[in-house]
């Protein structure tokens, strides 16, 4: 299997996460997308994912994870406002494309929340922000389920992510409807 | 075909104000994050200025902060520089680009020159 | 700020040769890095994305690789319109950063 590698992110509780997933646009642009947390002896799963097909810009809200799929650019926006310590944890990103397995991202991200004041920018964080509101229109897609998984063997698009601290307090309900999906590596 | 094209460059004095606009085609605007870069004579690429397509986020360089504002009207497909408080430094071609993050497609740049 | 260095800042070629180019990140941008090619008079023209994806209608010979903090931008034989002036830029973290450019010159 193809060893996957991770990315650590240290943030404060009320920060927000912005994972930008490159994806061949050729390939991928309207495929089904998602955002899984990986726990230790666990299967991943799914907190959230794109519709099916995937609708270019539109944003998609499961609690505090909203997903922006921009079939124009290639990019995966996933953004996880106002942190909480039991957000810490493995993240990734994945590709749907069934029949076949979803393509998994080398560069996992290890999320770490600290409590503490988040008041005053970090050395990660992003200074130059004047605008942060959350869409107050989004739609919740259901994520597929798959339950025969094999080897990933190519390698699939990558991801980074980079932290902001919204101007206004976000308050929005905890991720809901956790659905398993099996590992693929 | 994409389509960028500016205008509103020339040249101002120091302390002046300038408009730059962007008239976009060939894609669907409003699903599109836009943005700003500069480019001073001879020398490499800057980034300026980008905006979500809605208008909810909007992000500066340190340099032109509260100088610049960078908006749009998806009804026209136009995206706006206003530049005020202008420096030499700030002379510049500015490219009117598609993205936010990254820059798919490029206008043709409009040439800023701030001289006394 | 996520500065980028790029090397060498010019690079004498001959057609049909090999020409490898550097992009150093002062911190980690995992792979959301670009590059773009410029030609004198001409605005700049996107290539690679997510440090190895061409981009729609790049030529094969144009590749890309790394992660983290260090990335290779490659062409495997240039041709005459290859020539021009190569930049990397970052899109981990606004603001967003491009490196000073390396010239791919005639030699």
């Known amino acids: 299997a193809t060893k996957l590698t991770e990315e650590k992110y240290e943030l404060k509780e009320g920060q927000t996460l912005d994972v930008k997933c490159d994806y061949t646009l050729e390939k991928f642009a309207s495929s089904q997308k998602a955002w899984q947390i990986i726990r230790d002896g666990e299967m991943p799963k799914t907190l959230a994912c794109t519709e099916r097909p995937s609708k270019n810009s539109h944003p998609v809200q499961v609690g505090r994870i909203i997903l922006e799929d921009y079939h124009d650019h290639g990019l995966l926006r996933v953004r996880m406002v106002n942190l909480q310590v039991e957000d810490s944890g493995l993240y990734q990103c994945v590709i749907y494309q069934p029949p076949k397995e979803p393509h998994m991202l080398f560069d996992r991200i290890r999320l770490v929340v600290t409590k503490g004041f988040s008041g005053t920018p970090g050395s990660n964080e992003n200074s130059t922000q004047n605008v942060y509101k959350i869409p107050p229109t989004t739609t919740k897609a259901l994520c597929p389920l798959y339950t025969s998984p094999r080897t990933v063997t190519q390698a699939p698009p990558k991801s980074t992510a980079d932290v902001s601290t919204p101007d206004s307090e976000i308050n929005l309900t905890n991720v809901t409807d956790i659905i398993r999906v099996p590992v693929f590596n | 075909e994409v389509q960028l094209v500016e205008s509103g460059g020339g040249l101002v004095q120091p302390g002046g104000s300038l408009r730059l606009s962007c008239a976009a085609s060939?894609?669907?605007?409003?699903?599109?994050?836009m943005s700003w870069v500069r480019q001073a004579p001879g020398k490499g690429l800057d980034w300026v200025a980008s905006?979500?397509?809605?208008?909810?986020?909007?992000y500066y360089v340190d340099s032109v902060k509260g100088r610049f504002t960078i908006s749009r009207d998806n009804a026209k497909n136009s995206l706006h520089l206003q530049m005020n408080s202008l420096r030499a430094e700030d002379t510049a071609v500015y490219y009117c680009?598609?993205?936010?993050?990254?820059?798919?497609?490029w206008g043709q740049g409009t040439l800023v020159t701030v001289s006394s | 700020e996520i500065v980028m260095t790029q090397s060498p800042a010019t690079l004498s070629v001959s057609p049909g040769e090999r020409a490898t180019l550097s992009c150093r990140a002062s911190?980690?941008?995992?792979?959301?890095l670009a590059w773009y090619q410029q030609k004198s008079g001409q605005a700049p023209r996107l290539l690679i994305y997510?440090?190895?994806i061409r981009a729609t209608g790049i030529p094969a010979r144009f590749s890309g690789s790394g992660s983290g903090t260090e990335f290779t931008f490659t062409i495997s034989s240039l041709q005459s319109e290859d020539f021009a002036v190569y930049y990397c830029?970052?899109?981990?973290?606004?603001?967003?950063?491009f490196g000073g450019g390396t010239k791919v010159e005639i030699k």
């Open positions: 680009v598609r993205g936010g993050w990254r820059f798919e497609s």
């Open positions: 060939g894609f669907t605007f409003s699903s599109n994050w």
């Open positions: 905006m979500k397509q809605d208008g909810s986020e909007i």
């Open positions: 911190q980690s941008v995992s792979s959301n």
């Open positions: 997510g440090a190895s």
């Open positions: 830029q970052q899109y981990k973290n606004f603001p967003l950063t």
